[in-house]
């Protein structure tokens, strides 16, 4: 999805939202793991 039609501003917004959600999930998982390991 790196080129062509996917430069549409709605697609760019959805990509940003997806990345934010993914990072939140990964960081949340790491935080839980850290707390668990303490």
């Amino acid at each position: 999805h790196s080129d062509g039609i996917f430069t549409d501003s709605y697609s760019r917004y959805r990509k940003q939202m997806a990345v934010k959600k993914y990072l939140a999930a990964v960081l949340g998982k790491r935080y839980k793991q850290r707390v668990k390991n303490k």
Epitope: H1, G4, I5, D8, Y10, S11, R14, M17, A18, K21
Partner: antibody, heavy 119, light 110 residues
Framework: VEESGGRLVTPGTPLTLTCTVS????????MSWVRQAPGKGLEYIGI??????TWYASWVKGRFTISKTSSTTVDLKMTSLTTEDTATYFC?????????????????WGQGTLVTVSS | ALVMTQTPSSVSAAVGGTVTINCLAS??????LAWYQQKPGQPPKLLIY???TLASGVSSRFKGSGSGTQFTLTISGVECADAATYYC????????????FGGGTEVVVK
């Protein structure tokens, strides 16, 4: 998802349709309006996201405006209506976005509300 | 402009038979395509997304395939309940576009 506000109007009359959602929050999902003229196909109107940003089909040209009026309602304000705008207007929820699939799909639809523009 | 062209506009099938509907995108949309089923007086229902992924609760008789610009919806073991109009939709762009939907294909079951 439920639409309301459709009725018979004369050309040029403004009209506002309302989409009311339950079971989920508009802070979590983008929403869209799609219309269907009698016996015709589906026609995309536009999308409003969780931040209240909007995107429209090229034919809309400022005649229609999508806005959120509460955490459970989305409005479609229509102006300069003509007989060509006679259609069933659907409100639809947009799919979630994922890192490896951020395309958009219409996952949950209301039953639609009929707008008839006639003199 | 990105245009979705659906063929045929109408198709007739016998119960138990197979129906194939085609959707052509004027630009590469990778696998960003959905298929919908609409019965008279009802809203559309999402059948397939990401070109080939079945939506929840949809029969495995429905199969989506293709990528890039050419896509196909195949209905096997056609049942009377499959009589409906089917639409494809590109999910790649929504900003200042014409229409992300194809023109529709009416499936008549004999």
């Amino acid at each position: 998802v439920e639409e309301s506000g459709g009725r018979l109007v004369t050309p040029g009359t403004p009209l506002t349709l309302t989409c009311t959602v339950s079971g989920f929050s508009l802070s979590s999902y983008d929403m869209s309006w799609v219309r269907q003229a009698p016996g015709k196909g589906l026609e995309y109107i536009g999308i409003i996201n969780t931040n209240d940003d909007t995107w429209y089909a090229s034919w809309v040209k400022g005649r229609f405006t999508i806005s959120k009026t509460s955490s459970t309602t989305v409005d479609l304000k229509m102006t300069s209506l003509t007989t060509e705008d006679t259609a069933t207007y659907f409100c639809a929820r947009i799919s979630d976005a994922y890192v490896f699939d951020y395309a958009y799909y219409f996952t949950l639809w209301g039953q639609g509300t009929l707008v008839t523009v006639s003199s | 402009a990105l245009v979705m062209t659906q063929t045929p506009s109408s198709v007739s099938a016998a119960v138990g038979g197979t129906v194939t509907i085609n959707c052509l995108a004027s630009q590469n949309i990778y696998n960003s395509l959905a298929w919908y089923q609409q019965k008279p007086g009802q809203p559309p229902k999402l059948l397939i997304y990401r070109a080939s992924t079945l939506a929840s609760g949809v029969s495995s008789r429905f199969k989506g395939s293709g990528s890039g610009t050419q896509f196909t919806l195949t209905i096997s073991g056609v049942e009377c309940a499959d009589a409906a109009t089917y639409y494809c939709q590109q999910g790649a762009g929504a900003d200042n576009i014409g229409n992300p939907f194809g023109g529709g294909t009416e499936v008549v079951v004999k």
